[in-house]
Amino acid sequence: LIIGFGISGRHSITVTTVASAGNIGEDGILSCTFEPDIKLSDIVIQWLKEGVLGLVHEFKEGKDELSEQDEMFRGRTAVFADQVIVGNASLRLKNVQLTDAGTYKCYIITSKGKGNANLEYKTGAFSMPEVNVDYNASSETLRCEAPRWFPQPTVVWASQVDQGANFSEVSNTSFELNSENVTMKVVSVLYNVTINNTYSCMIENDIAKATGDIKVTESEIKRRSHLQLLNSKAS
């Protein structure tokens, strides 16, 4: 969480951002809130990016003002216009690119004052893993697949029964470049698994951590997976 304060002749207002991550090819949110003002026509929101000459986005007098927008963001940005009056200056970024990573500034002017806060935005790819029993294999084998990751993640297997065990000797992980030549498909195979046990396939890079669990018994198979973004710090 980053909290910034204005330092002008006017009063300062508090602006708060949250560091976040964008998934390449999908839409992302750059989060920013400020002390609300009841005078909508007086509110100005400016999003700037370090190293970029033009503006990322500008909202003023109740609508987008994009004449100064940098080419790299053309047609890809929007604020939640209906939420500005209650202090939400968050920016929706369409079709996130690897090059969108960097330091952004959310700069706010209201009738009460000015304020700004910076935001670190990371970009990469992350996806939910799915763990299945590989019936084609000669021995009891589990296959963990996740379609899109970048940068290249680490993959670690764990087991409920053999807690703390190192499965690196009985697993094999491969990374296959996807067609857009940036993200990769992750495939990890775990051999010699035993029934009546829960196995976890954990995939992690500096942006996200995802886990796929599978419980194999004689009568059924139960699966569960979840994904968590790392380093969501407010500012």
Epitope: P36, D42, I85
Partner: antibody, heavy 117, light 107 residues
Framework: EVQLVQSGAEVKKPGASVKVSCKVS????????MHWVRQAPGQGLEWIGA????????EYAPKFQGRVTLTADTSTSTAYMELSSLRSEDTAVYYC??????????WGQGTTVTVSS | DIQMTQSPSSLSASVGDRVTITCQAT??????LNWYQQKPGKAPKFLIY???QLAEGVPSRFSGSGSGTDYTLTISSLQPEDFATYYC?????????FGGGTKVEIK
Amino acid sequence: EVQLVQSGAEVKKPGASVKVSCKVSGYPFTSYWMHWVRQAPGQGLEWIGAIYPGKSDTEYAPKFQGRVTLTADTSTSTAYMELSSLRSEDTAVYYCTSTWTHYFDYWGQGTTVTVSS
Amino acid sequence: DIQMTQSPSSLSASVGDRVTITCQATQDIVKSLNWYQQKPGKAPKFLIYYTAQLAEGVPSRFSGSGSGTDYTLTISSLQPEDFATYYCLQFYEFPPTFGGGTKVEIK
């Protein structure tokens, strides 16, 4: 659940003052503007003013400037509207209304103020 | 101040009718307009925000549209519980101002 609960009806004489309260629950009271709106019998809605409890910033409609005072007690999440120098045309239902998710999204039940000699 | 002219001031309609209420601002309010429903002896109820977005729990027979200075509230098929007074509110420019109201009565 968001709730705005107002104080009871008041009967006042011309020239007197009235203070209406509005107790808030269900959202962060200090971080959002609280407005006051009134409605005279058989008439439309009229904005009086607003307060930002976190900083005690206030804004008033020019018509009420100098005669209305908005305050807030952040310890009890209660907003107050005091109207002085009452006259018969101030007879109305007074509402508090929040701007939490949107402008005037939640309303108090209203407080009837009757000014009569 | 921005003036909001609401029309008609009252209308009579039957259950199942399509009803349209309009609000005209004295200047562009950039879609910064909400609609409220009020029944006798009750506080106004939040209906539509930012011209066209339905508030939580509001039936889909209600819809809003408009831009610039002209805005419309439409009830596609009037139900018995819809007989009430409707108000528009502009919050683009200070101070916020309401329309005069439209009373929807049973024919």
